[in-house]
């Protein structure tokens, strides 16, 4: 299991910027416009535009409320007028440089509209949002805008019993079959488009990936066994001519594996996914947050998957098929029979075009019938290194974003920012042989779940934005200035931070104006380069004979042990003479002359099998009659 975060920052301890509007709740949709330096926030019955550099500065707002009549009709259907029968913004996607596509639950009558960014007013198009946005604010949803067309995963009906993955398009709308083998009570988590690589095979298609958890069809279990899935569709899909007419011909899904090898620890509930794209990366990497199905201990894991691994399952993997045994009992088994050509579920690529299949509408019925009956792959998608990047105890992770950053020595590190159901943000760096949890920051005053996380990693301006029920918080990617000494700065093992001997401060890397010459950073936590030992100040105390002295020592690191020394000998709490407050401050009872002298508080921290010791406080005590 990953260690505890090295540092814990309380809500008021660090520079966080907040945005919230009284009476407005459920800030669950965030969209960044990097070029405009604007963050768009979708909440219950409202959309806001705020300054991305300081989100407390509101630029625009627009309200989208439900009429009393609609509320009453919704309440008649057994829903709560005060909560459910409102308009929860669930889709907030860019449509053009001047408009956003916005959908809301609208009192169980999902509706979409265009938001003009110049006037910041809705155009009043009021399109039916069914299949694009859930009816119920409690139901899962995901969406991504691709070339002006909305791809979404949600439930299609009032009861929430009909799941759908669809493309909303004027010329070629597509949807999944309403059939259990295609989608079985899914909980949608994430969707994104992966553009064909410029140096990839000619005529390759863009693909849209959907991530969700659903009830297993392939494993018989005493309880509903949940399975995390990745599904993909092709952007160029136009449906079939007769079979799969207006349905996906390229819909395939596979199981995502996230488990600890040689242990019974299986993480099968997908919480969130982030696609890491970075200049130094050959291909995108999917980072996914999981929890186990029976999670009474609060376990969470992060697994990462390469695009190539995912693609290989869909393009070369075996299929599963539903077999009927004893008249009507269903068993899912590997399909070992002949696979039609073109390969079922494959995108129309140059090879297909060469065989005269220029569109999915030309595909032979055999291929279409096969993919209709075999949407599930037998092969599973395995994580990088066949193991989780991180397993954390006593925490329920909710969302993840990942930044790839360059350390002072030129090495690239993936830094994960993972939010919790109690309003905290964990920051963890992936090192060669371990994951180091740098810090934990309490983003929200109340311990409320983080609903959404967004990363803005524009050079010289990097922030994480978190949305919750009560508001949005903006946090910098690092709090370097909080590390008061060179040792602290290096021991943080934060790739964003380095010690500047010139100004005797821990500074943030990649600030455009900064020159990093002479800066000290060591991702192994080696503090030997920290030569400028800060001049040792001390606190002088005078105490009365027979009294009790409390000597303070402030130690931030959760990984360090506080050691008190007197006359160069270590003080133990076992002795009736001494006691510790919060494992940090020293109490000396029944003071006598022999207690006069120099007391040193040191922190001892194990880093890579080495103990790093640093002086935290020095107290000179004098006992008087």
């Amino acid at each position: 299991f990953a260690p505890v975060p090295r540092l814990t920052w309380e809500h008021g301890e660090v520079g966080l910027v907040q945005f919230h509007k009284p009476g407005i709740f459920n800030y669950s949709a965030l969209l960044m416009s990097e070029d405009k330096d604007t963050l768009y926030v979708g909440a219950r019955e409202a959309v806001f535009a705020v300054n991305a550099l300081n989100i407390s500065e509101k630029q625009h707002e627009v309200y989208w409320k439900v009429s009393e009549d609609k509320k009453s009709k919704c309440a008649e259907k057994g829903k709560s007028k005060q909560t459910e029968c409102l308009n929860y913004i669930r889709v907030l996607q860019p449509l053009s440089s001047t408009s956003l596509y916005v959908c809301g639950t609208n009192a169980f009558q999902p509706t979409c509209d265009h938001l003009n960014l110049t006037s910041f007013k809705f155009l009043g198009k009021s399109e039916d949002g069914k299949g694009r946005c859930p009816f119920d604010p409690a139901h899962s949803y995901t969406s991504v805008m691709v070339g002006g067309e909305l791809y979404s995963g949600t439930s299609y009906n009032f009861l929430g019993s009909e799941p759908i993955i669809s493309r909303n398009s004027s010329h070629s709308p597509l949807r999944t079959e309403y059939a259990i083998p295609w989608l079985n009570e899914p909980s949608f988590v994430f969707a994104d488009v992966i553009q064909k690589s410029p140096d990839g095979p000619e005529g390759e298609d863009d693909k849209v990936y959907f991530f969700f958890t659903e009830v297993s069809v392939e494993y018989e279990f005493v309880f509903k066994l949940m399975i995390p899935r990745v599904a993909r569709v092709c952007k160029g899909d136009q449906g079939g001519l007769r079979t799969l007419q207006k349905k996906w011909t390229s819909f395939l899904k596979a199981r995502l594996i996230c488990s600890k090898p040689d242990s019974g620890l299986v993480f099968n509930i997908l919480q969130d996914v982030f696609v890491l794209r970075a200049p130094g990366l050959k291909e995108p990497v999917f980072y996914a947050v999981f929890t186990p199905q029976l999670n009474n201990v609060g376990l969470s894991a992060v697994c990462a998957y390469t695009l190539a691994t995912v693609e290989a399952v869909f393009s070369r993997g075996k299929y599963m098929q539903s077999a009927t045994v004893e008249q009507s009992h269903t068993k899912w088994v590997r399909y070992n029979g002949p696979v039609p050509t073109p390969r079922p579920g494959a995108c129309i690529d140059s090879e297909a075009r060469a065989a005269n299949y220029t569109s999915s509408l030309n595909l032979p019925d055999k291929t279409l019938q096969f993919v209709k009956d075999h949407p599930l792959m037998d092969d599973s998608v395995t994580p990088i290194d066949n193991r989780p990047k991180l397993i954390k105890k006593d925490v329920n992770y909710t969302q993840i974003v990942v930044d790839r950053t360059q350390a002072l020595d030129g090495t690239f590190y993936d830094v994960m920012f993972i939010s919790t159901d109690r309003g905290a943000l964990h920051k963890a760096v992936i090192l060669t042989k371990e994951v180091h949890v740098i810090e934990e920051t309490q983003l929200f005053r109340d311990s409320e779940p983080v609903l959404t996380l967004l990363l803005s990693s524009k050079k010289g301006r990097k922030f994480v934005y978190a949305g919750s029920n009560s508001g949005v918080v903006q946090a910098p990617l690092a709090f370097c200035e909080k590390h008061g000494s060179c040792e602290d700065c290096v021991l943080a093992r934060d790739p964003y931070c380095a010690w500047s001997p010139a100004i005797k401060a821990c500074v943030t890397l990649h600030q455009e104006e900064a020159s990093s010459r002479g800066w000290i950073q060591d991702m192994s936590g080696d503090t030997s380069s920290c030569l400028d030992k800060s001049k040792e100040s001390f606190n002088q105390h005078f105490f009365k004979h027979g009294g009790t002295a409390e000597l303070k020592c402030f130690q931030k690191s959760n990984l360090a042990r506080v050691v008190w020394k007197f006359q160069n000998g270590e003080l133990k709490a076992a002795s009736p003479k001494y006691g510790f407050v919060g494992r940090k401050h020293l109490l000396i009872f029944n003071l006598s002359d022999g207690d006069s002298g120099v007391y040193q508080c040191l922190s001892e921290e194990r880093v890579r099998n080495k103990t790093v010791s640093q002086l935290l406080a020095k107290h000179v005590l004098e006992v008087k009659m």
Epitope: K130, I180, V217, Q327, S328, T330
Partner: antibody, heavy 118, light 111 residues
Framework: QVQLVQSGAEVKKPGSSVKVSCKAS????????MHWVRQAPGQGLEWMGQ????????SYNQKFKGKATITVDKSTSTAYMELSSLRSEDTAVYYC???????????WGQGTTVTVSS | DIVMTQSPDSLAVSLGERATINCKAS??????????MNWYQQKPGQPPKLLIY???NLESGVPDRFSGSGSGTDFTLTISSLQAEDVAVYYC?????????FGQGTKLEIK
């Protein structure tokens, strides 16, 4: 061939309960949703609710919430509908029907007549 | 709920003649260009039988004298040449929005 066979007719007293069964054969039971539809004497058809056989997840027409409970037994490929607190207006023929890919009821059970009389 | 209204309530047509039954929905039953409208035939003492799905698709095994048309809110079931075995009650049904609703039925008889 694909078949849905329902249990026989029932005569029940007001206030009692009845459980109607629907046994599927000839297809993969877990691959299709099962729905229940009722037809009161001389009346039209009314959709009551549905169940996902793999999960046991049921959803109901608001009108029948609290009246009908739909369940499945995967091991016997059988769907059930229990009607509680029976009243004379619950007298009807109850049908189970398979919901096919194209969003229609393609196979129906023969129907079970439930008569509520004191 | 979507209300389905069939017309006429009953219809008498001569053998070999065309029979037309209409169904009007209180709101559109279309989604992305598909019409989720189905037609069923029910004979006395029997369960309903699917004839047409998605407004115009003929269920396999159903004679091609049956056809369906329409979109949005207005739909039609046509029997091009009435046969004696077509005497029954015909129901339209929408599956675009729950609760799924049926028309009140049209009784077709021979004149």
């Amino acid at each position: 061939q694909v078949q849905l066979v329902q249990s026989g007719a029932e005569v029940k007293k007001p206030g009692s309960s009845v459980k109607v069964s629907c046994k599927a054969s000839g297809y993969s039971f877990s691959d299709y949703y099962m729905h229940w539809v009722r037809q009161a004497p001389g009346q039209g058809l009314e959709w009551m609710g549905q169940i996902n056989p793999t999960t046991g997840g049921a959803s109901y027409n608001q009108k029948f919430k609290g009246k009908a409970t739909i369940t499945v037994d995967k091991s016997t490929s059988t769907a059930y509908m229990e009607l509680s607190s029976l009243r004379s207006e619950d007298t009807a023929v109850y049908y189970c029907a398979r919901y096919y890919y194209g969003r229609h009821f393609d196979v129906w059970g023969q129907g079970t007549t439930v008569t509520v009389s004191s | 709920d979507i209300v389905m209204t069939q017309s006429p309530d009953s219809l008498a047509v001569s053998l070999g003649e065309r029979a037309t039954i209409n169904c009007k929905a209180s709101q559109s039953v279309d989604y992305d260009g598909d019409s989720y409208m189905n037609w069923y035939q029910q004979k006395p003492g029997q369960p309903p039988k699917l004839l047409i799905y998605a407004a115009s698709n003929l269920e396999s095994g159903v004679p091609d004298r049956f056809s369906g048309s329409g979109s949005g809110t207005d739909f039609t079931l046509t029997i091009s040449s009435l046969q004696a075995e077509d005497v029954a009650v015909y129901y339209c049904q929408q599956s675009n929005e729950d609760p799924y609703t049926f028309g009140q039925g049209t009784k077709l008889e021979i004149k």
